[in-house]
């Protein structure tokens, strides 16, 4: 039961995390104009990975895409790549983990297969989360560098736009969304890997051994047993029925096409 909960929670946490990574990647507010030095400005600039926006004081916003690939800073391209890799890995991880969920039965898929899929998706989520955290951190570092350079009366380039000493850019909302989302995806991935250990069937066949204790005798009859991994609530050895790989709480007479629990 605990294995199912851990796996399910890992899936949900990763799903939220990947949704957050997608949201952060699409958001325009990766860097926002620092208004500390110029509170009377009527023009507010903010920039994303794909376009830059200008908001007039009275509310009208105009955004312009970066219609160049070669003209953009290499760091920005690297951040884009990291975020996209994170999304792709996360999406594949989600797809794999859906089929790996213990509460969903597809045909006669064995626990070992589910365990492998759970581990695969877990690793994918971990790498996806790391990609997002790395991407956001690289961008944040770029901002910090440019912030202090512009403070020191230097001219810097950000997001393919000319930035004079007048305007400094600071962390936008997308960075925080990205960090949190990356962290959630990472946590979800770790949970999936933990769940995998609880799913893995470590089968051991014991020979018939007769023990004689004082007072009474207990005979252990031969039969296949499923060894407990010590994870989750599956602490008792459970007898395998019909030589299959299913435990008592998963009895299924005939696997049907659409057999979901």
């Amino acid at each position: 039961m605990a294995v199912t909960a851990c796996q399910g929670l890992g899936f949900v946490v990763s799903l939220i995390g990947i949704a957050g990574i997608i949201a952060a990647t699409c958001m325009d507010q990766w860097s926002t104009q620092d208004l500390y030095n110029n509170p009377v400005t009527a023009v507010f600039n903010y920039q994303g990975l794909w376009r830059s926006c200008v908001r007039e004081s009275s509310g009208f916003t105009e955004c312009r895409g970066y219609f160049t690939l070669l003209g953009l800073p290499a760091m920005l391209q690297a951040v884009r790549a990291l975020m996209i890799v994170g999304i792709v890995l996360g999406a594949i991880g989600l797809l794999v983990s859906i089929f790996a969920l213990k509460c969903i039965r597809i045909g006669s898929m064995e626990d070992s297969a589910k365990a492998n899929m759970t581990l695969t998706s877990g690793i994918m989520f971990i790498v996806s989360g790391l990609c997002a955290i790395a991407g956001v951190s690289v961008f944040a570092n770029m901002l910090v560098t440019n912030f202090w350079m512009s403070t020191a009366n230097m001219y810097t380039g950000m997001g393919g736009m000319v930035q004079t000493v007048q305007t400094r850019y600071t962390f936008g909302a997308a960075l925080f969304v990205g960090w949190v989302a990356g962290g959630l995806t990472l946590i979800g991935g770790v949970m999936m890997c933990i769940a995998c250990r609880g799913l893995a069937p470590e089968e051991t066949n014991y020979k018939a051994v007769s023990y004689h204790a004082s007072g009474h005798s207990v005979a252990y009859k031969p039969g296949g047993f499923k060894a407990s991994t010590g994870f989750g609530s599956n602490t008792k050895n459970k007898k395998i029925y019909d030589g299959g790989a299913r435990t008592e709480d998963e009895v299924q007479s005939y696997p049907s096409k659409h057999d979901y629990v």
Partner: antibody, heavy 115, light 112 residues
Framework: QIQLAQSGPELKKPGETVKISCKAS????????MNWVKQAPGKGLKWMGW????????KYADDFKGRFDFSLETSARTAYLQIKNLKIEDTATYFC????????WGQGTSVTVSS | DIVMTQAAPSVPVTPGESVSISCRSS???????????LYWFLQRPGQSPQLLIY???NLASGVPDRFSGSGSGTAFTLRISRVEAEDVGVYYC?????????FGSGTKLEIK
């Protein structure tokens, strides 16, 4: 097409209150802020401030803080300028103009304050 | 506050000729996003102002291409080629980079 239709001319006495309306049509009202501009007889243009038609947030130029009030009736797509405790020097034509760039203007409302 | 200065109160011109109207700002209107927040308006006699040029050099919709805007961060020029009778009125420059938005005093275009 985009239009800003302002209310008719007003003749008021000092100390009274006037409320001018500016009804927008032809565009999404809440997407663009509304500016108010004053033009005294024979003088140039003076920016009074703006109202954000989405949030209702207002910003006033220093000379127009206190007696001047911008408001909205979003359902009627209308912005209002209210001037309280009118003074002789408030005699002017008041224009509403769309967004910071003031790309569209109302026809103006003439307010005459005389005792 | 940013002060907008239009030195010439009026400019006489013969129809068909070209004319330039100048405007200066007390502070650069060039923003870090590459835009210069300088606008030109024409107020014909008895009418409300009309936007001619936005962000220093962009022609507003419906405005004839006889009008053009240019300038640097602080010095700006509105040029009208082949002046027509309908171009008479007062030309105002305005900045909306910072609060409060400020207008120049205006330059009146008169036909000789």
């Amino acid at each position: 097409q985009i239009q800003l239709a302002q209310s008719g001319p007003e003749l008021k006495k000092p100390g009274e209150t006037v409320k001018i309306s500016c009804k927008a049509s032809g565009y999404s009202f809440t997407n663009y802020g509304m500016n108010w501009v004053k033009q005294a007889p024979g003088k140039g243009l003076k920016w009074m401030g703006w109202i954000n038609t989405y949030s209702g947030e207002t910003k006033y130029a220093d000379d127009f803080k206190g007696r001047f009030d911008f408001s909205l009736e979003t359902s009627a797509r209308t912005a209002y300028l209210q001037i309280k405790n009118l003074k002789i020097e408030d005699t002017a034509t008041y224009f509403c103009a769309r967004r910071d760039a003031m790309d569209y203007w109302g026809q103006g409302t003439s307010v005459t304050v005389s005792s | 506050d940013i002060v907008m200065t239009q030195a010439a109160p009026s400019v006489p011109v013969t129809p068909g000729e070209s004319v330039s109207i100048s405007c200066r700002s007390s502070k650069s209107l060039l923003n870090s996003n590459g835009n210069t927040y300088l606008y030109w308006f024409l107020q014909r006699p008895g009418q409300s102002p009309q936007l001619l040029i936005y962000r220093m050099s962009n022609l507003a919709s419906g405005v004839p291409d006889r009008f053009s805007g240019s300038g640097s961060g602080t010095a700006f020029t509105l040029r009208i080629s082949r002046v027509e009778a309908e171009d008479v009125g007062v030309y105002y420059c305005m900045q909306h980079l910072e609060f409060p938005f400020t207008f120049g005093s205006g330059t009146k275009l008169e036909i000789k």
